[in-house]
Every structure is written in structure tokens, then in C-alpha cells.
């Protein structure tokens, strides 16, 4: 397909030719072309590409251009043929490749397909049966990352309420641009009735810890120092608690934002790998005070900021007073 | 008690570098991130980026990228903020503050003021 | 990029009323994040609220920040002398333009 520019052009190169588009992995889609026949000897050829809503654009000397992009709507590149790098100067007439997602009704295609990175470790997807779909529809999740040589197929599919889902492991590499990558992901069923669904969930979102566990609460003064397990596989730049303490005869609920705390006093268990401490200050010891902590990753880490881990569970120390 | 101690004022000419200095007491240095601020003349605050000294990641604003340094050497507790080349609009009252993981500057530097002027 | 938009840009108040104080979110931001200084004339910042409604360290809780989503508020419930000043909300690496809170 040709695009061709309604202004009036000075002298142009001619357009590109052979230009195809294929899928790799599951979201990759990558465009090939090879240079225009008899363009200008003195000319050293550049490419000018967008993609069809003009947008993304791009002025290399490659004879190709990929994108990592869910495959649920058509996309299109045009390019064009130039002998600069100047985005002013008219590329070539435009030369359009457009790629469709797989057939199917769309109605049929499941849809909230959003996932969610666990701890570091393991990533689970969830996904609504779309509304054309029989009941009994067996669905299989395929995801593929950086890391892995080919496409896999999610294994421990499971139902909550009216969600279907899917867990895979997927473990943080010491490689330092690891995170750097998107994990693609494909539902279909294993019938081939429904319309696939894709998704790309970068490594940088969608990222929830585990709960911290709590060792140890004891009183000093009138301080409550609160010590606590810090959930693996996390730096301490990318994590924060917020430490919940509840006062059955005040009724008073307070919370403190903390960082990665080292136990440095007498009163806690010292040096002990991956734990971390705080002080609650001008609390009764003669009352019952219950805490609770909860972690979230740091925006500078990881881009999804509204993802909090469960809170830990409940441990409390003092006395509850009889009410007279 | 947290203190954050910037270098002294400076008075430069365009094209010349710079580099001035945050230190940090009172708190472990190396568990806090430090950020840079900028604020020119009569205007408001603008983040230039920020600086974690456990392992000296660091993240810059997208205006500021490329424009500026940001470093720190965590034996003596001190962040560093420099120029390669000045212009006359890096005129402007820099400070450094400390961040924790939520992102708020709980304690500032006193401020320096570069002056960039042939 | 989110972009933080402060009103009013001035507020001309007298010493005893209320102050109320708009910061808005161009998309919707995580209230663990958003933070609330006052500057006075030849000073630093101050950090006054944090994670939108918790008070920082010595400051009077005639201050108070609320809000979350795209919609956050600082509120003086009865200004004193000294809380005359500019006021500014921040997410990371972003910062809205500033209030100034003046003598009426």
C-alpha cells in the first residue's frame, strides 16, 4: 500500500521495497524492508517510519523496526526512504504494512486479563471469561520473557469466584537490566473458539511484596519497639512499611511511614539478617496495643505505585483493662 | 539530629564547571536517598534528581538529564551535585535534602546559591 | 508526566480564619506520596505533611492534609502570624507551581 503526502514535493527517493511484517514471541512484531531501487547514488540512506496514528516516529538506517505491543487490534507502520537524518526533509512516498490480530469474535476474547508480580518470584494472571463463551471453556495462559528460549504454557491454571487465572515462577535475575524487560502473555483455550487475548506487563509495575512478619514487640519506657522480618528478594531502596498500632483504651490508631530500619538498640535482637526495627514512641505499656505492618515498593524502583502488600499479621503486648 | 550541610556560595563565569556538596549527619547516610532542588530566581521548586549512597543508583529528571551530575562518596557522607559547563540560566538557589522511600524531603540543606555571570 | 496544579495562586486571609489549600493530580497518584511544604522568604523548604495526611515531625496540627486519587487538600485550621508563606505540594519528581498564603 502506498501513502503518499498531499503537499507538493521537491525531489524524493523512491519508495521501499518488500516490506513485510511477522510476529515473534508473542508480542514482538517486527517490520522488514529492503532499500528503494534506484535511489541516488549520492545519497546515504535513511529510513523515516511512524506507526499509523503517526505516532512513535523514527528516522534510522536500519531496513527494520520492531515493537513490543499486545496483539488485541490491527497496527500499522509506513515508511518512507530519505538521504538525511532531518525530520523537515520529504521521505520517499510512504509505504504501509498493517498487521491483524488473530481472527475470532471479539466478544468471545477474555477480557481484565492484568497480572501481577509476587515478591519477586512468582507472577500471577487473572482474566473474566469474555461474554461469548461457553461455561465450560478450558483456557491456557502462554507467557514469554528476555529470560526464557521459547514461548511457555502456564500449568496451574485455577478459578476464584468468577475469575480464571494463572501462576507461573518467575524469579528476579541478578542482571541488572532484567527489569528493564516486559513479560508478554497470551490467553486462548485450548479449543480455538475464543478470540486470543495478549498482554505485556513490564517488570517495572504491578509489583506486590510479601507481608513482613513480626518477631518481637517489647517496651522500653515508654516506647514499643517493634521488630520485624523484611520479605526477600527486595533492595532496601525499594521498599517502605507503614506500621499500624491500635490502642484498645485510647482507641487511637496510629500509623508511621518507615524505612529500612537496622536494629541498633540493646533492646533488639541484633545483626540479624533481612529484619528491621522501629521505635513507637510515647506509647502505654499498661494498655493492649496491637500492630500490624504492611511494605510497599518505592516509585524510584518500580513504577506501580498503588500495590501494598497484605498486612502481616497481628501481634499485640500489654495488658487489656478489665472496663469497670 | 539530622543536619544536612551544603558548600558556600559560588560565582561563576559561563563555560566554567562546577561542583558543589551536600553533607550529611546525624542519620545513616547510606539508608536515605538524597535529592537535589533547584529554585530560580522569584520561582518555585523544581526536583532535579536523586541519589541513593547505599550503591549510588541515581535517577534525574528528565530536564535535567544530561545536563547535570549527581554523585556521592559514602566514606565522608557527602553528595555531590556539578556542572561541566555553566550557563547564565544555572543562576539559581540549589538544595540538597534528604529522601526517604516515599518520596517527601524530610530534612534540607540551608541552600547554595550559584550565580552564573560573565 | 504527572503534573501537579496548585489554587488558588494566592490566598489573602487574615491571622485566626482557615486556610484551604487545592493540589491536583493531572492522573491519579498513590496518597503515600504526596508531601506538602512551606517556604518563607530567604529559607528552605519545610516539610509539613507527608503520605497526604501524616504530620511531620514538630508541626502544629492546626495543619492537616487530606485527600487522595487526583484531589488533595492542605488545611490551616487557624493561621498564625508565622504561617504566612508559599506552600507547595510534591509527588517524587514533581512539584505543583505554589501557593502563597498572604496577610488580607
Known amino acids: 500500500d502506498y501513502k503518499d503526502d498531499d503537499e507538493s514535493r521537491t525531489e524524493t527517493q523512491p519508495p521501499v521495497t518488500n516490506l513485510s511484517v511477522s510476529v515473534e514471541n508473542l508480542c514482538t512484531v517486527i517490520w522488514t524492508w529492503n532499500p528503494p531501487e534506484g535511489a541516488s547514488s549520492n545519497c546515504s540512506l535513511w529510513y523515516f517510519s511512524h506507526f499509523g496514528d503517526k505516532q512513535d516516529k523514527k528516522i534510522a538506517p536500519e531496513t527494520r523496526r520492531s515493537i513490543e505491543v499486545p496483539l488485541n487490534e490491527r497496527i500499522c507502520l509506513q515508511v518512507g526512504s530519505q538521504c538525511s537524518t532531518n525530520e523537515s526533509e520529504k521521505p520517499s512516498i510512504l509505504v504501509e504494512k498493517c498487521i491483524s490480530p488473530p481472527e475470532g469474535d471479539p466478544e468471545s476474547a477474555v477480557t481484565e486479563l492484568q497480572c501481577i508480580w509476587h515478591n519477586l518470584s512468582y507472577m500471577k494472571c487473572s482474566w473474566l471469561p469474555g461474554r461469548n463463551t461457553s461455561p465450560d471453556t478450558n483456557y491456557t495462559l502462554y507467557y514469554w520473557h528476555r529470560s526464557l528460549e521459547k514461548i511457555h504454557q502456564c500449568e496451574n491454571i485455577f478459578r476464584e469466584g468468577q475469575y480464571f487465572g494463572c501462576s507461573f515462577d518467575l524469579t528476579k535475575v541478578k542482571d541488572s537490566s532484567f527489569e528493564q524487560h516486559s513479560v508478554q502473555i497470551m490467553v486462548k483455550d485450548n479449543a480455538g473458539k475464543i478470540k486470543p487475548s495478549f498482554n505485556i506487563v513490564p517488570l517495572t509495575s504491578r509489583v506486590k511484596p510479601d507481608p513482613p512478619h513480626i518477631k518481637n514487640l517489647s517496651f522500653h519506657n515508654d516506647d514499643l519497639y517493634v521488630q520485624w522480618e523484611n520479605p526477600q528478594n527486595f533492595i532496601s531502596r525499594c521498599l517502605f512499611y507503614e506500621v499500624e498500632v491500635n490502642n484498645s483504651q485510647t482507641e487511637t490508631h496510629n500509623v508511621f511511614y518507615v524505612q529500612e530500619a537496622k536494629c541498633e538498640n540493646p533492646e533488639f535482637e541484633r545483626n540479624v539478617e533481612n529484619t528491621s526495627c522501629f521505635m513507637v514512641p510515647g506509647v502505654l505499656p499498661d494498655t493492649l496495643n496491637t500492630v500490624r505492618i504492611r511494605v510497599k515498593t518505592n516509585k524510584l524502583c518500580y513504577e506501580d505505585d498503588k500495590l501494598w502488600s497484605n498486612w502481616s499479621q497481628e501481634m499485640s503486648i500489654g495488658k487489656k483493662r478489665n472496663s469497670t | 539530629e539530622v543536619q544536612l550541610v551544603q558548600s558556600g556560595a559560588e560565582v561563576k563565569k559561563p563555560g566554567e564547571s562546577l561542583k558543589i556538596s551536600c553533607k550529611g549527619s546525624?542519620?545513616?547516610?547510606?539508608?536515605?536517598?538524597i535529592g537535589w532542588v533547584r529554585q530560580m530566581p522569584g520561582k518555585g521548586l523544581e526536583w532535579m534528581g536523586v541519589?541513593?549512597?547505599?550503591?549510588?543508583?541515581?535517577r534525574y529528571s528528565p530536564s535535567f538529564q544530561g545536563q547535570v551530575t549527581i554523585s556521592a562518596d559514602k566514606s565522608i557522607s557527602t553528595a555531590y551535585l556539578q556542572w561541566s559547563s555553566l550557563k547564565a540560566s544555572d543562576t539559581a538557589m540549589y538544595y540538597c535534602a534528604r529522601m526517604p522511600n516515599w518520596g517527601s524531603l524530610d530534612h534540607w540543606g540551608q541552600g547554595t546559591l550559584v550565580t552564573v555571570s560573565s | 508526566e504527572i503534573v501537579l496544579t496548585q489554587s488558588p495562586g494566592t490566598l489573602s486571609l487574615s491571622p485566626g480564619e482557615r486556610a484551604t489549600l487545592s493540589c491536583r493530580a493531572s492522573?491519579?497518584?498513590?496518597?503515600?506520596?504526596l508531601a506538602w511544604y512551606q517556604q518563607k522568604p530567604g529559607q528552605a523548604p519545610r516539610l509539613l505533611i507527608y503520605g497526604a495526611s501524616s504530620r511531620a515531625t514538630g508541626i502544629p496540627d492546626r495543619f492537616s492534609g487530606s485527600g487522595s486519587g487526583t484531589d488533595f487538600t492542605l488545611t490551616i485550621s487557624r493561621l498564625e502570624p508565622e504561617d504566612f508563606a508559599v506552600y507547595y505540594c510534591?509527588?517524587?519528581?514533581?512539584f505543583g507551581q505554589g501557593t502563597k498564603v498572604e496577610i488580607k
Open positions: 546525624g542519620y545513616s547516610f547510606t539508608s536515605y536517598w
Open positions: 510534591q509527588q517524587y519528581e514533581t
Open positions: 541519589i541513593y549512597p547505599g550503591d549510588s543508583y541515581t
Open positions: 492522573q491519579s497518584i498513590s496518597s503515600s506520596y
